[in-house]
Amino acid sequence: MAVTACQGLGFVVSLIGIAGIIAATCMDQWSTQDLYNNPVTAVFNYQGLWRSCVRESSGFTECRGYFTLLGLPAMLQAVRALMIVGIVLGAIGLLVSIFALKCIRIGSMEDSAKANMTLTSGIMFIVSGLCAIAGVSVFANMLVTNFWMSTANMYTGMGGMVQTVQTRYTFGAALFVGWVAGGLTLIGGVMMCIACRGLAPEETNYKAVSYHASGHSVAYKPGGFKASTGFGSNTKNKKIYDGGARTEDEVQSYPSKHDYV
């Protein structure tokens, strides 16, 4: 039950995260005109990964796409690439995780296959989240650098008579959406990986045998070898006495189809 909940929650959190990454990538407000300590303009500028926009006091908003690839800064291209990779990985992760969900039955899919799919989707979500966080952070760093550069030469004038105020840009809403969404996708991925541990079945090399003693029943359960997921901690053979009472370690590992107690 706990595994199903962890896996389900991981899926939902990742789904929200990836939706957020998509939203952030499409948003126009990656950088917005800095209004602090600046002359109040009747024009508000903001920019996204794909186009820049101007909202006028009159209520008119005009957006223009970046209709060039080669003319754009390398950093912007890198951010675009990171966000797209994040979305693609996240989308594939979602697709894989749907089939991996414990609550969904697809034919006679083994638990081991579901565990592997859960782990795969978890890793994909983690990488997707990291891509989004990296993309947003690179853009934020670029903004900070440009902000201080434009502050240094805020007023460029002709002999001190005519002044041109340089438009400074600060963090837009998309950056915060991206950071939160990337974090959620990352958390969702970690939850999927944790759920994978519980899904990994206990595979044995031989069938378990029940021994019935005359006094009280004693069941002997060989531990055998774990599936090669590397997540198993229970590698010892355990004896269970007192009519099938389990040790603390064993309560954590879920019974497999070979358990006869």
């Epitope: 009747a42 101007v54 009159s58 209520g59 002044q163 041109t164 105020v165 438009t167």
Partner: antibody, heavy 120, light 112 residues
């Protein structure tokens, strides 16, 4: 046809107050940014205040800040300018204007104006 | 506040003549975001409210005769009337539409 009709002007003593009104017709009033502009007896044009369409943000000239309030009633299609602590330098012809939505913040329509005289 | 300086303050012209008037702003009215200039020109005839002629420094408002041309960028702007007609005799104002407070020039009076 777009029409802006101002009213409420008149003679007032220094320190007195006045409320100007502007009834708009022929366009969706609530979505347009509106302004008040005054013309002094010397024929100089001076922007007074602006209220942003939709958002309702307001901007004021430094010379009137704290003494003048711009507001709107979209249900009545009316723009207001509440003036208090009037001074002699507030004597002017007050125009109600509309900022055109594709005119780069330029005022595409003006009313005929209402005259305000501040004198003892 | 942005200072708008218009020159000359008055112009005496004959019908059919070409007229040029200037407007200079103390700060650039060019927006880097869309590379547009936020400057408007208005015409005011006696006893009438101002009428919008040019916006965005160079775009003619609908219904304005094509003899009126706006040009310039940044801080220096010009309004040209290619062939003055009797009905063009008025006061012409330039206005900063970029910074609050919006400011107007003192005007250029066109007279015969």
């Amino acid at each position: 046809e777009v029409m802006l009709v101002e009213s409420g002007g008149g003679l007032v003593k220094p320190g007195g107050s006045l409320k100007l009104s502007c009834v708009a017709s022929g366009f969706t009033f609530s979505s347009y940014t509106m302004s008040w502009v005054r013309q002094t007896p010397e024929k100089r044009l001076e922007w007074v205040a602006t209220i942003i369409g939709g958002y309702g943000n307001t901007y004021y000239s430094d010379s009137v800040k704290g003494r003048i309030t711009i507001s709107r009633d979209s249900a009545k299609n009316t723009l207001y300018l509440q003036m208090i602590s009037l001074r002699s330098e507030d004597t002017a012809l007050y125009y109600c204007t509309r900022l055109g939505q594709t005119q780069r913040n330029a005022m595409d329509y003006w009313g005929q104006g209402t005259s305000v005289t501040v004198s003892s | 506040d942005i200072l708008m300086t218009q020159s000359p303050s008055s112009l005496s012209v004959s019908a059919g003549e070409k007229v040029t008037m200037n407007c200079k702003s103390s700060q650039s009215l060019l927006n880097s975001g869309n590379q547009k200039n936020y400057l408007a020109w208005y015409q005011q005839k006696p006893g009438q409210p101002p009428k919008l002629l040019i916006y965005g420094a160079s775009t003619r408002e609908s219904g304005v005769p094509d003899r009126f041309t706006g040009s310039g960028s940044g801080t220096d702007f010009t309004l040209t009337i290619s062939s003055v007609q009797a009905e063009d005799l008025a006061v012409y104002y330039c206005q900063n539409d970029y910074y609050y407070p919006f400011t107007f020039g003192a005007g250029t009076k066109l007279e015969l």
